[in-house]
């Protein structure tokens, strides 16, 4: 799996999970989240060469097509596969509220 | 939706469905499929600017992060959303066989 266990231990130019820390205030301009101040969002990036972690039959076909037709622009792309929620604390007036924001953290990647 | 109805009628640099015909023998080297000789596989390509058809909370956050940090390499990618199967005819010796290959045709795209 193209997850932290694999990607953070290997120097990998191909599609892999990359570390990314997002500071809510500085990077998104979000002042409404009280805690945490930021989080490890991570992201997916890298080349999707021949059959590298191909996700669907179509991405496999596209990968093949690209190998046989290297001048083609039709190639798979490195995107998130498994995502996890993030629990945040924010205030409605003086009332604290805990909320779970779905699909905020990328845990693994795929070529799709 | 970033499907044929929208994308094939509009000149769109942003993430959209693109036409791609794949000839099994010529483009993939597959001799085993008897019919069809090829098919409209399509593919997804184009930029994923701020909130353009963002798929998940994470891709929205990444899109926003990228807007505020334009030098960052962490940006969403244009990938397939809805896929459809393709029915093929092949031969096992002299005996014809019909098979449905799943996820072979891209019908729409998203930024993920």
């Amino acid at each position: 799996a193209l997850d932290a266990a694999y990607c953070f231990r290997n120097v990998q130019d191909n599609c892999c999970l990359r570390p990314l820390y997002i500071d809510f205030k500085r990077d998104l301009g979000w002042k409404w989240i009280h805690e945490p101040k930021g989080y490890n969002a991570n992201f997916c990036a890298g080349a999707c060469p021949y059959l590298w972690s191909s996700d669907t039959q179509h991405s496999r076909v596209l990968s093949l097509y690209n190998t046989i037709n290297p001048e083609a622009s039709a190639s798979p792309c490195c995107v998130s596969q498994d995502l996890e929620p993030l629990t945040i604390l924010y205030y409605i007036g003086k009332t604290p509220k805990i909320e779970q924001l779905s699909n905020m953290i990328v845990k693994s990647c795929k070529c799709s | 939706a970033l499907d044929a109805a929208y994308c094939f009628r509009n000149v769109q640099d942003n993430c959209c469905l693109r036409p791609l015909y794949i000839d099994f023998k010529r483009d993939l080297g597959w001799k085993w499929i008897h019919e069809p000789k090829g098919y409209n596989a399509n593919f997804c390509a184009g930029a994923c600017p701020y909130l353009w058809s963002s798929d998940t909370q994470h891709s929205r956050v990444l899109s926003l992060y990228n807007t505020i940090n334009p030098e960052a390499s962490a940006s969403p990618c244009c990938v397939s959303q809805d896929l459809e199967p393709l029915t093929i005819l092949y031969y096992i010796g002299k005996t014809p066989k019909i098979e449905q290959l799943s996820n072979m045709i891209v019908k729409s795209c998203k930024c993920s």
């Epitope: 496999r60 076909v61 093949l64 046989i68 | 080297g29 001799k31 010796g93 290959l101």
Partner: antibody, heavy 120, light 108 residues
């Protein structure tokens, strides 16, 4: 260069399973059907089945159906043949071979063979 | 399943002689579903002929295949020392693929 490289010889006990690998060069894996052939000591050739790697369509000989599983790993261009519930008569050299392109076809490139010995 | 019967079981000839190997099918294969292989001890089979009469790349012209329906022939026009081996025919018209029992070509 076209190559099919098979895993090393194995010794197994009756009732066990064996999984033989066949690593192929890229183009073979993309475009061809991979067949598996059994050759018992001093005997002839017996086709076990074939698999189309990219789409994972497998076709098995009736004699091996239920005991043999052919799979493909697209990340490593490797095809696998797993034979379960081994019997002493399964002692043989197992070959992987690429066909000329059809599901049933002549086989133009062959692996070096993997000897599987089943003995108690 | 289609049974292939090869004859003779053993063929003893000298280098320079002509070898004729026969393969008979229990049912008609049409004209293009038969292959011939050569196998030497400790080696994998090597494809010689496919489609009953087409020579595989790199196979010398002294090897030729003919036949259709149920009767097929492999001919080696002038035997070389390296041609002494076991020869198998294979049908791929129907599943399962089947092979003949082999013809051993030995030096006389």
């Amino acid at each position: 260069e076209v190559q099919l490289v098979q895993s090393a010889a194995e010794v197994k006990k009756p009732g066990a399973s064996v999984k033989v690998s066949c690593k192929t060069s890229g183009y073979i894996f993309i475009s061809n059907v991979i067949s598996w052939v059994q050759q018992a000591p001093g005997a002839g050739l017996e086709w076990m089945g074939g698999v189309i790697p990219i789409v994972d369509i497998a076709n098995y000989a009736q004699r091996f159906k239920g005991r043999v599983t052919l799979t493909a790993d697209t990340s490593t261009n490797t095809v696998y043949m797993e034979l379960s519930n081994l019997r002493t008569e399964d002692t043989a050299v197992y070959y992987c071979a690429s066909t000329l392109g059809l599901v049933l076809d002549a086989m133009d490139y062959w692996g070096q063979g993997t000897l599987v010995t089943v003995s108690s | 399943e289609t049974v292939l019967t090869q004859s003779p079981g053993t063929l003893s000839l000298s280098p320079g002689e002509r070898a004729t190997l026969s393969c008979r099918a229990s049912q008609s294969l049409g004209s293009s579903y038969l292959a011939w292989y050569q196998q030497k001890p400790g080696q994998a089979p090597r494809l010689l002929i496919y489609g009953a009469s087409s020579r595989a790349p790199g196979v010398p012209a002294r090897f030729s295949g003919s036949g259709s329906g149920t009767d097929f022939t492999l001919t080696i026009s002038s035997l070389e020392p390296e041609d002494f081996a076991v020869y198998y025919c294979q049908q791929y018209a129907d599943s399962p693929i089947t092979f003949g029992q082999g013809t051993k070509l030995e030096i006389k």
